[in-house]
């Protein structure tokens, strides 16, 4: 988890002098509770936005937006703590909006935004906005949270971001798999424009089951430049096991930008349809 560029982060707006600060996620008001605390944020909204770094890279960011409730506690609001927790790693990053002037009610509802938390493809985050100071131990909570899922690199808008392109999102192998005679599969796919090797991982399963009955790995050496964007055809021999008929073919590239952690593409061949067994024809016809 990180912030997009450390260019000047702004939270000031007409009628409010405000500064954005790094935070330890442990605000002082936890340790030294205050008697009067503000109410919670209203209408927390999170969207996926895209932002360029100063180097020109494009990253997905969480755009966080919330409004203030129109009650008197606005007079005791000193700022806000924004927290993003990545659920699979338990990594947390916080920033603090510090209000340098007192808020006053004005003709429209106060609204705040922040769009600098860089998020990763296919990850889930808990996004929390905590008004400061935080409540006393038994006080009403004054935060709002949402669990936010970021689309993976298959998403059209995500595909062109720097992290997705680095993992090979622009490569479309257009895999085709056909069953040949004599227990063989022909796998065909389009090579990318990089001289790097590939691996084909074949996993076979029985008709309705999910434990594999056959596994095979096939190495494809790095293509020459004249072979870039050409089709590569590979014939794989299957184990002759009755009922081991559903085949998943996965192609793993080893691009220089992602090495052994590149996006994999797969295709599945289903078991052939079993024809309905016809009713047996009796040897004689009953006469009734």
């Amino acid at each position: 988890l990180r912030l997009l560029d450390h260019r000047a982060l702004v939270c000031s707006q007409p009628g409010l002098n405000c500064t954005v600060k790094n935070s330890t996620c442990l605000d002082d008001s936890w340790i030294h509770p205050r008697n009067l605390t503000p109410s919670s944020p209203k209408d927390l909204q999170i969207q996926l936005h895209f932002a360029h770094t100063q180097q020109g890279d494009l990253f997905p960011v969480a755009h966080i937006e919330w409004t203030l409730q129109t009650d008197a506690s606005i007079l005791y609001l000193e700022g806000a703590e924004l927290s993003v927790l990545q659920l699979n790693t338990n990594e947390r990053l916080c920033v603090r909006f510090e209000f340098l002037s007192k808020l006053r009610h004005h003709h429209r509802r106060w609204r705040f935004t922040f769009s600098h938390f860089v998020v990763d493809p296919d990850q889930e985050y808990e996004v929390t906005v905590h008004h400061l100071p935080k409540p006393i131990p038994d006080g009403d909570p004054n935060h709002q949270s949402k669990n936010f899922l970021v689309p993976d690199c298959e998403h059209a808008r995500m595909k062109v971001t720097t992290p997705c392109m680095s993992s090979g999102s622009l490569w479309d192998p257009n895999i085709t798999v056909e069953t040949l005679e004599a227990h063989q599969l022909r796998v065909s796919f389009t090579l990318w424009n990089e001289s790097t090797h590939y691996q084909i991982l074949l996993t076979s399963f029985p008709h309705m089951e999910n434990h594999s009955c056959f596994e095979h790995m096939h190495h494809i050496p790095a293509p020459r430049p004249e072979e870039f964007h050409q089709r590569s055809n590979v014939t794989l021999t299957l184990r002759n096991l009755k009922g081991c008929c559903r085949h998943q073919v996965q192609i793993q590239p080893f691009f220089s930008s992602c090495l052994n952690d590149c996006l994999r593409h797969s295709a599945t061949v289903s078991c052939p349809e079993m024809p309905d067994t016809p009713e047996p024809i009796p040897d004689y016809m009953p006469l009734w």
């Epitope: 996926l48 949402k146 689309p151 808008r157």
Partner: nanobody, 126 residues
Amino acid sequence: QVQLVESGGGLVQPGRSLRLSCAASGFTFDDYAMHWVRQAPGKGLEWVSGISWNGGSMDYADSVKGRFTISRDNAKNSLYLQMNSLRAEDTAVYYCAKDRGLGYCRGGSCSSLDYWGQGTLVTVSS
């Protein structure tokens, strides 16, 4: 322009099933999370279910969990709600709605729902 058109509502007996459909047009359907929201007679709006852009994540209101199933077919720009074991309290106008922003939030919409269909009435009565 964005259009969401619901269909499949009607009168059904308690315990029976119904499948609602929503045909979407005018935007890139597979970029956005989609939701079903309902409004019972004389009541406010109630979020029913949501589904992520690719159908990989789905969430339901407690009142329908285990009975309703949301799904989508991005190739057909369509959203569905399979409603089983219907109860009288499921009687409502059901709306299909699009999330304003990209991304998906558990248990509701991430941001406001910016486009809604005209709704389809589901009446559960014996």
